[in-house]
C-alpha cells in the first residue's frame, strides 16, 4: 500500500463547498473524507470541479463503496455519472424513477452512451417490466429507445405502457419489433372508436396482419402513403384492389409514385391488370386478363 500524503494543516474539509475547487488533486485525496462526500453528494453538481478533480472524488467513493454505491449517493451523482463505467453501474441497484431521471438529465442532448444503456438495463431488470412511467421517462429522453430493444425485451412491455408511445418513438423500429408491439397496441386501444383508434394505432401498423388491414379498409380511415409503405409486404399482398382503394381513400393516387417500391410493387404483381385499371392510375405489371392465379402457398400447406 502506497503511503498516503497527509492533509496540510487547516485544509481538512468540513463540508463540500466551493473552496475545494482550488485544492490540488492530492489535497482533495488527503483532505476530503469519503463519508462526508457521500452525505453531501448533492453539492458536487453545483460546484465547477475539473474533470481531474472529479476523478479524485470518484476514487474516494469507489473506496468507500467497493460493492457499488447506494441509491442515496447515485441519485446525486450529477456530472460525476459521466465518469462511471458500465462495470461500475452493473454494481448498482437503482429502483427509483427519480434517480433514473436525475442521471438521464446529466446525459441529456447526447447519444445514448454505454453507461446510460447499462443504467437503463439495470433499472428495467430491477422493475421486472417496462411500465408506463418508465417508458414515459425513457422515450422523453431518448425517442428511439423502444426501437433499440430486442423483440424479446419488448415482450415485457405491458399493453398499458403503449399509451406513452409517440409516433416518433417508433421511427427506427424494424418489422420484427413492430410485430411484437402491434398486438399490444391493438389491445391497449381496443375500446376507442374508429377514427380515434386509427390515429393511435397508425404508427404500429407495420406489425399488422392482413385480416386487420382488411377490417380497417371497411372503416373509411384514409391511410396515408407513408403509413402504407411501412406495412408488412406479406400482409399487403392478399389485399384486393377494392380493399386497398378503401384503405387509402383519397391517398390512393399516391400508389403511382410508389409503383416501383415495396410493398406496392409486389402487390401490383399479385393483382389482375383489369382490377388495377379500375383505379385509373395507369398502374402496370398486373396479371394479364385470362391468366389463372394459383395460390402456391395454399398448395404447399395441403401437400
Amino acid at each position: 500500500e502506497v503511503e498516503k500524503t497527509a492533509c496540510p494543516s487547516g485544509k481538512k474539509a468540513r463540508e463540500i463547498d466551493e473552496s475545494l475547487i482550488f485544492y490540488k488533486k492530492w489535497e482533495l485525496e488527503a483532505c476530503v473524507d469519503a463519508a462526508l462526500l457521500a452525505t453531501q453528494m448533492d453539492r458536487v453538481n453545483a460546484i465547477p470541479f475539473t474533470y481531474e478533480q472529479l476523478d479524485v472524488l470518484k476514487h474516494k467513493l469507489d473506496e468507500l463503496y467497493p460493492q457499488g454505491y447506494p441509491e442515496s449517493v447515485i441519485q446525486h451523482l450529477g456530472y460525476l455519472f459521466l465518469k462511471m463505467s458500465p462495470e461500475d453501474i452493473r454494481k448498482w441497484n437503482v429502483t427509483s424513477l427519480e434517480t433514473l431521471k436525475a442521471l438521464l438529465e446529466v446525459n441529456k442532448g447526447h447519444e445514448m452512451s454505454p453507461q446510460v444503456a447499462t443504467l437503463i438495463d439495470r433499472f428495467v431488470k430491477g422493475r421486472g417490466q417496462l411500465d408506463k412511467d418508465t417508458l414515459d421517462t425513457l422515450t422523453a429522453f431518448y425517442p428511439g429507445y423502444l426501437c433499440s430493444l430486442s423483440p424479446e425485451e419488448l415482450s415485457s412491455v405491458p399493453p398499458s405502457s403503449i399509451w406513452a408511445v409517440r409516433p416518433q418513438d417508433l421511427d427506427t423500429c424494424d418489422p420484427r419489433q413492430l410485430d411484437v408491439l402491434y398486438p399490444k397496441a391493438r389491445l391497449a386501444f381496443q375500446n376507442m372508436n374508429g377514427s380515434e383508434y386509427f390515429v393511435k394505432i397508425q404508427s404500429f401498423l407495420g406489425g399488422a396482419p392482413t385480416e386487420d388491414l382488411k377490417a380497417l379498409s371497411q372503416q373509411n380511415v384514409s391511410m396515408d402513403l407513408a403509413t402504407f409503405m411501412k406495412l408488412r409486404t406479406d400482409a399487403v399482398l392478399p389485399l384486393t384492389v377494392a380493399e386497398v382503394q378503401k384503405l387509402l381513400g383519397p391517398h390512393v393516387e399516391g400508389l403511382k409514385a410508389e409503383e416501383r417500391h415495396r410493398p406496392v410493387r409486389d402487390w401490383i404483381l399479385r393483382q389482375r391488370q383489369d382490377d388495377l385499371d379500375t383505379l385509373g392510375l395507369g398502374l402496370q405489371g398486373g396479371i394479364p386478363n385470362g391468366y389463372l392465379v394459383l395460390d402456391l402457398s395454399m398448395q404447399e400447406a395441403l401437400s
Epitope: 463547498d17 466551493e18 482550488f22 453545483a46 465547477p48
Partner: antibody, heavy 116, light 110 residues
C-alpha cells in the same frame, strides 16, 4: 464566528486613488476565494472583483478592469482593492465577501464617494 | 442593464406565497449554480440560498430555491413583515469570467 471588516473608504476626487482593506477572521482565510461587490446609492449589487486563495488568477468586471487591482495577504488574513483613476460612477458602498461563486459572508461595507 | 433578469417588485399579504424569478442564459444559470441574497433596508446583503436550493443554517425553511435550465426562482411561503427587503439572484458566468447579479426584486408585505 466569521467576520469581515472593510476600511479605507472616503471622499476622493475624480482621477484619484484609494486602497480598500478587508480584515477577515473566524475562518481559514488562505483556503477561500474572496470577492469585492459594490452598490451605488439606490442601485443594485454589482460584482467588482474576485481572487482565488493562492492569488494565481484575478477576475474583474469590465467596468473596473485596468483601473482596479485586487490582492490578498494570507499571512495577515487581509484582502485589498487598489482603486485608481476613480470616476463619479465608482461612487458606492464597497463590500468584501467570502467566496467567489456564492457569497456566504459579507462585511458591513465601506462608502467610497468620488466627487469634485 | 443586468445580465440576469428579475422582476423589479413583488408583493403579498402576510401568510401568502411569493415567487421571484431570475432568468439568465446557458453561460451563467444554465451551467452554474445560482445563489439568492436578501438585503434588508440599510444593511449588508445576506446569503439566503446557495447551490440552487440549499439554505445556510439560520435561514428559515419558508425560503426555497430551485433551478431549471436557464432560469431560477426563489419562493417565500408564509410571508412575514420582516421579509420586506430587496432580493438578488446571482451566478458565475464563465463567458464573462465574472459573477453576475440580477437587478433585484423589492418585496413588499401589504
Amino acid at each position: 464566528e466569521v467576520q469581515l471588516l472593510e476600511s479605507g473608504g472616503g471622499l476622493v476626487q475624480p482621477g484619484g486613488s484609494l486602497r480598500l482593506s478587508c480584515a477577515a477572521s473566524g475562518f481559514t482565510f488562505s483556503n477561500y476565494a474572496m470577492s469585492w461587490v459594490r452598490q451605488a446609492p439606490g442601485k443594485g449589487l454589482e460584482w467588482v472583483s474576485g481572487i482565488p486563495p493562492n492569488s494565481d488568477s484575478k477576475y474583474y468586471a469590465d467596468s473596473v478592469r485596468g483601473r482596479f487591482t485586487v490582492s490578498r495577504d494570507n499571512s495577515k488574513n487581509t484582502l485589498y482593492l487598489q482603486m485608481n483613476s476613480l470616476r463619479a460612477e465608482d461612487t458606492a458602498v464597497y463590500y468584501c465577501a467570502k467566496n467567489m461563486l456564492s457569497f456566504d459572508y459579507w462585511g458591513q461595507g465601506t462608502l467610497v464617494t468620488v466627487s469634485s | 442593464q443586468s445580465v440576469l433578469t428579475q422582476p423589479p417588485s413583488a408583493s403579498g399579504t402576510p401568510g401568502q406565497r411569493v415567487t421571484i424569478s431570475c432568468t439568465g442564459s446557458s453561460s451563467n444559470i444554465g451551467s452554474n449554480a445560482v445563489s439568492w441574497y436578501q438585503q434588508l433596508p440599510g444593511t449588508a446583503p445576506k446569503l439566503l440560498i446557495y447551490y440552487n436550493s440549499k439554505r445556510p443554517s439560520g435561514v428559515p425553511d419558508r425560503f426555497s430555491g430551485s433551478k431549471s435550465g436557464t432560469s431560477a426562482s426563489l419562493a417565500i411561503s408564509g410571508l412575514r413583515s420582516e421579509d420586506e427587503a430587496d432580493y438578488y439572484c446571482g451566478s458565475w458566468d464563465p463567458s464573462l469570467n465574472g459573477y453576475v447579479f440580477g437587478g433585484g426584486t423589492k418585496v413588499t408585505v401589504l
